[in-house]
Interface confidence: low
């Protein structure tokens, strides 16, 4: 069927349109275009005879039309009057006629719109503003944008006049925004420049900063006032009702108590004619003195004395605070505060109570801190330690012993040999010792301030022959796969070699065996039951050698998974059931039995005489080792058959 397609359908003025013909018949004589919806000779635009290829303009020809051999019609420089229907009349070679109609619409190119306003300075919560999009254009759609967003839904926003007018009722400061209008038709869209709505508002209630209302005498008072306002507010300050100055900031240097009072900021908006005020009460306090700490005992003795620290000076209606080691006071029964917190008492001081201590006076503004105080706690002496730890020496070497005891003030030291005073020094030195120098060496430490003394005695043996060593252990009953054991060969002797044997053999190579401390210590990691052997240590030097008695390691292990014997599981009725349970364990485990989950006796052997089919079920043996804290169990099913029903059954015991 013959059809006409308009490309485009909506045409902008000045542009062109192509009336495109579809399904044009074959064997044509010619065709003709008409303006309108029917063939009308008075409204012929152009005709075309195919045989002569001759185009003939008609009465409606404007000079802007071009006809193509495929019968399509191009119209250029479109004008508004071109809008409407166009009819193609086709004459076939058999002189049969065929018609088709198409149409298009012409729209003007829109100009750039602009916004007019009925109120350039509306007042907040009072005025309305009407924006109108200019110019008024036929067949145009009007749109509005606020801050480049489409209009929000609001009862205060109203569109009218075919959306050409946007009215804002009861404007607020939040309506201060960029407004644009847009005109659209099918062939163009244009957006206006922004119009910024300038809403007059305020002043709001002013805020005075800073917020603090308490000051010290001698400080500078610097108050700033701010109120939201458009145009910006004009400010005035009043002190106790008396006008001071018309500035946003009020500055009073070196204030005194006399500057206490009510400070009022007034904000004024000359355009809205509104005034708002805010009042703050300023209190000026006299400067307090810096606190300091006094003590009732400058040299307390550990575990004997109490110390009372007092924060000076005493001021009425003041809060006192304390810090120890730069932290707030810990909770301790040895720390007591007086009712007013001014005195901190340390009951039964220790050497860890040295401090530093700090007190503070808190008042309206902040806390003023004292300088720190450190306690000189007298303590000790603790039990002295004598070094080195050797107890065995060879003749001819030098003996050099040093003594130390924790003490404040530092301890004074004395040495005694076999009870006889030798010298008042911290170190004792004897050159080229002999067997006669063997004996009891005593170090005495004395604290002159507390009057306390402590002593430590060490046995020194001087001998060419090495003594018989012995083995000490840090764990006499280690648990398998859990504990480590450290054997140490005693005594510690100078210039001595230490050796170890296990079951009479030299030490095997094993990652679980480690020698340390000059081979004096043998450590077994993750002991196993196989480590339960005889361990011997030996010492030797250039003139002698000696071995210890063996020490057998008692490794606790198990219980392993138990075994129930005999292995039979089928019995004849009337037989005796005699089950024995065994589990590898050190020490021997405790045994118990359960039949079908019901506890029975705590024995290694379970005996039931003349069993019947009622004795069918599960027999469980439980083992527990109280030393290792471990448990184990095994379950065996027993089937009892009536006599003679099944061959091959055990007759029992």
């Amino acid at each position: 069927k013959l059809t006409i397609e308009s490309t485009p359908f909506n045409v902008a003025e000045g542009k062109e349109v192509l009336l495109l013909v579809h399904n044009l018949p074959q064997h044509l004589f010619g065709y003709s275009w008409y303006k309108g919806e029917r063939v009308d000779g008075n409204r012929q635009i152009i005709g075309y005879v195919i045989g002569t290829q001759q185009a003939t303009p008609g009465p409606a020809y404007s000079g802007r039309e071009i006809i193509y051999p495929n019968a399509s019609l191009l119209i250029q420089n479109i004008i508004q009057n071109d809008t409407g229907f166009y009819t193609l009349h086709v004459i076939k070679s058999d002189l049969v006629n065929e018609e088709a109609t198409g149409q298009f619409r012409v729209y003007p190119e829109l100009p750039k719109p602009s916004i007019s306003s009925n109120n350039s300075k509306p007042v907040e919560d009072k005025d309305a503003v009407a924006f109108t999009c200019e110019p008024e254009t036929q067949d145009a759609t009007y749109l509005w944008w606020v801050n480049n967003q489409s209009l929000p839904v609001s009862p205060r926003l109203q569109l009218s006049n075919g959306n050409r007018t946007l009215t804002l009722f009861n404007v607020t400061r939040n309506d201060t925004a960029s407004y644009k209008c847009e005109t659209q038709n099918p062939v163009s869209a244009r957006r206006s420049d922004s119009v910024i709505l300038n809403v007059l508002y305020g002043p709001d209630a002013p805020t005075i900063s800073p917020l603090n209302t308490s000051y010290r005498s001698g400080e500078n008072l610097n108050l700033s006032c701010h109120a939201a306002s458009n145009p910006p507010a004009q400010y005035s300050w009043f002190v106790n009702g008396t006008f001071q100055q018309s500035t946003q900031e009020l500055f009073i240097p070196n204030i005194t108590v006399n500057n206490s009072g009510s400070y009022t900021c007034q904000a004024h908006n000359s355009d809205t004619g509104l005034n708002r005020t805010t009042v703050t009460t300023i209190t000026v306090y006299a400067e307090p003195p810096k606190p300091f700490i006094t003590s009732n005992n400058s040299n307390p003795v550990e575990d004997e004395d109490a110390v009372a620290l007092t924060c000076e000076p005493e001021i009425q209606n003041t809060t006192y605070l304390w810090w120890v080691n730069n932290q707030s006071l810990p909770v301790s029964p040895r720390l007591q505060l007086s009712n007013d917190n001014r005195t901190l008492t340390l009951l039964s001081v220790t050497r860890n109570d040295v401090g530093p201590y700090e007190c503070g006076i808190q008042n309206e503004l902040s806390v003023d801190h004292s300088d720190p105080v450190i306690l000189n706690v007298l303590y000790g002496p603790d039990d002295p330690t004598i070094s080195p730890s050797y107890t065995y020496y060879r003749p001819g070497v030098n003996l050099s012993l040093s003594c130390h005891a924790a003490s404040n003030p530092p301890a004074q030291y004395s040495w005694l040999i076999d009870g006889n005073i030798q010298q008042h020094t911290q170190e004792l030195f004897i050159s080229n010792i002999t067997e006669k120098n063997s004996g009891l060496y005593t170090c005495q430490a004395n604290n002159s301030a507390s009057g306390h003394s402590r002593t430590t005695v060490k046995t020194i043996t001087v001998s060419a022959e090495l003594p018989k060593p012995s083995i000490s252990s840090n764990n006499s009953k280690p648990v398998e796969d859990k504990d480590a054991v450290a054997f140490t060969c005693e005594p510690e002797a100078q210039n001595t070699t230490y050796l170890w044997w296990v079951n009479g053999q030299s030490l095997p190579v094993s990652p679980r065996l480690q020698l340390s401390n000059g081979n004096r210590t043998l450590t077994l990691f993750n002991v196993t039951r196989n480590d339960a052997r005889a361990y011997v240590c030996g010492i030797q030097n250039s003139v002698s050698a000696n071995r210890s008695d063996p020490v057998t390691l008692d490794v606790l292990y198990g219980p392993d998974t138990p075994i129930i014997s005999p292995p039979d599981s089928s019995y004849l009725s009337g037989a005796n059931l005699n089950l024995s349970c065994h589990s590898a364990s050190n020490p021997s485990p405790q045994y118990s039995w359960r039949i079908n989950g019901i506890p029975q006796q705590h024995t290694q052997v379970l005996f039931i005489a003349k069993i019947t089919p009622n004795n069918n079920g599960t027999y469980a043996c439980f083992v527990s080792n109280l030393a290792t804290g471990r448990n184990n169990s095994i379950v065996k099913s027993i089937t009892v058959s009536a006599s003679g029903t099944s061959p091959g059954l055990s007759a029992g015991a």
Epitope: S214, Y215, R216, G218, E219, Y285, E287, P288, K290, N326, P356, E358, G360, L365, S366, V367, D368, H369, D371, P372
Partner: nanobody, 117 residues
Framework: QVQLVESGGGLVQPGGSLRLSCAAS????????MSWVRQAPGKGLEWVSG????????RYADSVKGRFTISRDNAKNTLYLQMNSLKSEDTALYYC??????????RGQGTLVTVSS
């Protein structure tokens, strides 16, 4: 006449460092406990740090602990504040003060520290 003059402030990026100095005169600096205090825009004074007379004992507000270090040089009558790992919330006017903190004794005119990227 007590005089305290702060210096060393400026604009620094987050994570940066500054060292503030306070030159003191007109009083016995070596026998006075000294503090740094600050006032952020639109806020009240906040105590930052304090140091005793010989510099052996220092204290810090929780908000700056581990980042700021206070020190003093009694021979030069100068108080210092080393500020590391600065944050935007450290933006404030920094004052040095005689005594334990807010409102205690004289303060200087302050030095502005702005932490911004």
């Amino acid at each position: 006449q007590v005089q305290l003059v702060e210096s060393g402030g400026g604009l620094v990026q987050p994570g940066g460092s500054l060292r503030l100095s306070c030159a003191a005169s007109g009083f016995t600096f070596s026998s006075s406990y000294m503090s740094w205090v600050r006032q952020a825009p639109g806020k009240g004074l906040e105590w930052v740090s304090g140091i005793n007379t010989d510099g052996s004992f220092t204290r810090y507000a929780d908000s700056v602990k581990g980042r700021f270090t206070i020190s003093r040089d009694n021979a030069k009558n100068t108080l210092y504040l080393q500020m590391n790992s600065l944050k935007s919330e450290d933006t404030a006017l920094y004052y040095c003060a005689v005594g334990g903190g807010l409102g205690y004794g004289p303060r200087g005119q302050g030095t502005l520290v702005t932490v911004s990227s």
